[in-house]
């Protein structure tokens, strides 16, 4: 006879799964806030900075009532993938000025990647429909100047911070509806 069967496989508690995702998101939110503050200290922002290639804001007070778990996770994953690509681009093409943000920018990239894998796992554990593979995104043009790289960094970190902030709020809300 073979080895005795192991304990019955317990299906994951969705609230606990969501809890750990919230913790990771909160942690990344704090990291992003610190890095954005570091950037502001080194290169003060003059006014607001935008980057057309960044995703548009997906959540607001008005949208909270209609939130559904599959939609939130799919959209959050898509937006964070875009931010991951922008952070990678920033590290590669941002210029020597932004080298002063290393190793923090590298750590942020690794943690963002980890959160994305966590979201993917959460979607499969909750048996949510998996999004189709992402189409290859057009390459991001290198910044036109050193100052262009700094402006892009302000836009990327500011947008990521705002996205994560709403993500925590949305995920906390969804947890109460499970």
């Amino acid at each position: 006879p073979g080895p005795p069967p192991g304990p019955p496989r317990v299906s994951p508690d969705p609230r606990a799964e969501l809890d750990s995702t919230v913790l990771l998101t909160r942690s990344l939110l704090a990291d992003t806030r610190q890095l954005a503050a570091q950037l502001r200290d080194k290169f003060p922002a003059d006014g607001d900075h935008n980057l057309d290639s960044l995703p548009t804001l997906a959540m607001s007070a008005g949208a909270l009532g209609a939130l559904q778990l599959p939609g939130v996770l799919t959209r959050l994953r898509a937006d964070l993938l875009s931010y991951l690509r922008h952070v990678q681009w920033l590290r590669r093409a941002g210029g020597s000025s932004l080298k002063t943000l290393e190793p923090e920018l590298g750590t942020l990239q690794a943690r963002l990647d980890r959160l994305l894998r966590r979201l993917q796992l959460l979607m499969s554990r909750l048996a949510l429909p998996q999004p189709p593979p992402d189409p290859p995104a057009p390459p991001l043009a290198p910044p036109s100047s050193a100052w262009g790289g700094i402006r892009a960094a302000h836009a990327i970190l500011g947008g990521l911070h705002l996205t994560l902030d709403w993500a925590v709020r949305g995920l906390l809300l969804l947890k109460t509806r499970l």
């Epitope: 922002a45 007070a61 008005g62 705002l162 902030d165 109460t176």
Partner: antibody, heavy 117, light 110 residues
Framework: EVQLLESGGGLVQPGGSLRLSCAAS????????MNWLRQAPGKGLEWVGV????????YYADFVKGRFTISRDNSKNTLYLQMNSLRAEDTAVYYC??????????WGQGTLVTVSS | QSVLTQPPSASGTPGQRVTISCSGS????????VNWYQQLPGTAPKLLIY???LLPSGVPDRFSGSKSGTSASLAISGLRSEDEADYYC???????????FGGGTKLTVL
């Protein structure tokens, strides 16, 4: 640097109207939900309402529903509070504040509204 | 009458640790993030703690927040004279569909 500057406060008679403005600068105004809050003299903070970043959704505290209206003009980076049918108990310092999620991360310095005959 | 309940006053001497409590219900603190604001005399409120225990940039780590069930607390260690202010807790309330505050706690540094 993020800045929020309220204006339009003053003395108004009960039953009267007033429109407050909040000029925003130093951030992408059209990305953020915006709120009005108030504080009666010597009292605590009270939330008045919120408007979504694109102006499509608004939530109000029960005590102002039907009397106060929040609006925004993203092209002018300005938030508004139209106050009608004012009462003595609406006397307060009114603040505008930015919301990136569940909290108010930047506040204006406030404008005083006095409702009295 | 405020939806969230805070003690009206608290006090401590310089260097001491003080804690301010905030209690609510499942529709606000129980299900939503708690935020804390500091209001120095004659000034606008300032965000002190968000999402229960996160510190915004520029807030010293002498300040900390925690939450358990339907209650939250703000702790200030190494108390300084400049910490003398009013402190407010806040959370979204699912039943009221709006933001609710505590009545505020006046902190005196003796």
């Amino acid at each position: 640097e993020v800045q929020l500057l309220e204006s339009g406060g003053g003395l108004v008679q009960p039953g009267g109207s007033l429109r407050l403005s909040c000029a925003a600068s130093g951030f992408t105004f059209s990305h953020y939900d915006m709120n009005w809050l108030r504080q009666a003299p010597g009292k605590g903070l009270e939330w008045v309402g919120v408007i979504s970043y694109d102006g499509s959704n608004k939530y109000y505290a029960d005590f102002v529903k039907g009397r106060f209206t929040i609006s925004r003009d993203n092209s002018k980076n300005t938030l508004y509070l139209q106050m009608n049918s004012l009462r003595a108990e609406d006397t307060a310092v009114y603040y505008c504040a930015r919301t990136p999620g569940s909290h108010f991360d930047y506040w204006g310095q406030g404008t005083l509204v006095t409702v009295s005959s | 009458q405020s939806v969230l309940t805070q003690p009206p006053s608290a006090s401590g001497t310089p260097g001491q640790r003080v804690t301010i409590s905030c209690s609510g219900s499942s529709s606000n603190i129980g299900n939503n993030a708690v935020n804390w604001y500091q209001q120095l005399p004659g000034t606008a409120p300032k965000l002190l703690i968000y999402y229960d225990d996160l510190l915004p940039s520029g807030v010293p780590d002498r300040f900390s927040g925690s939450k358990s069930g339907t209650s939250a607390s703000l702790a200030i260690s190494g108390l300084r004279s400049e910490d003398e202010a009013d402190y407010y807790c806040s959370a979204w309330d699912d039943s009221l569909n709006g933001v609710v505050f505590g009545g505020g706690t006046k902190l005196t540094v003796l």
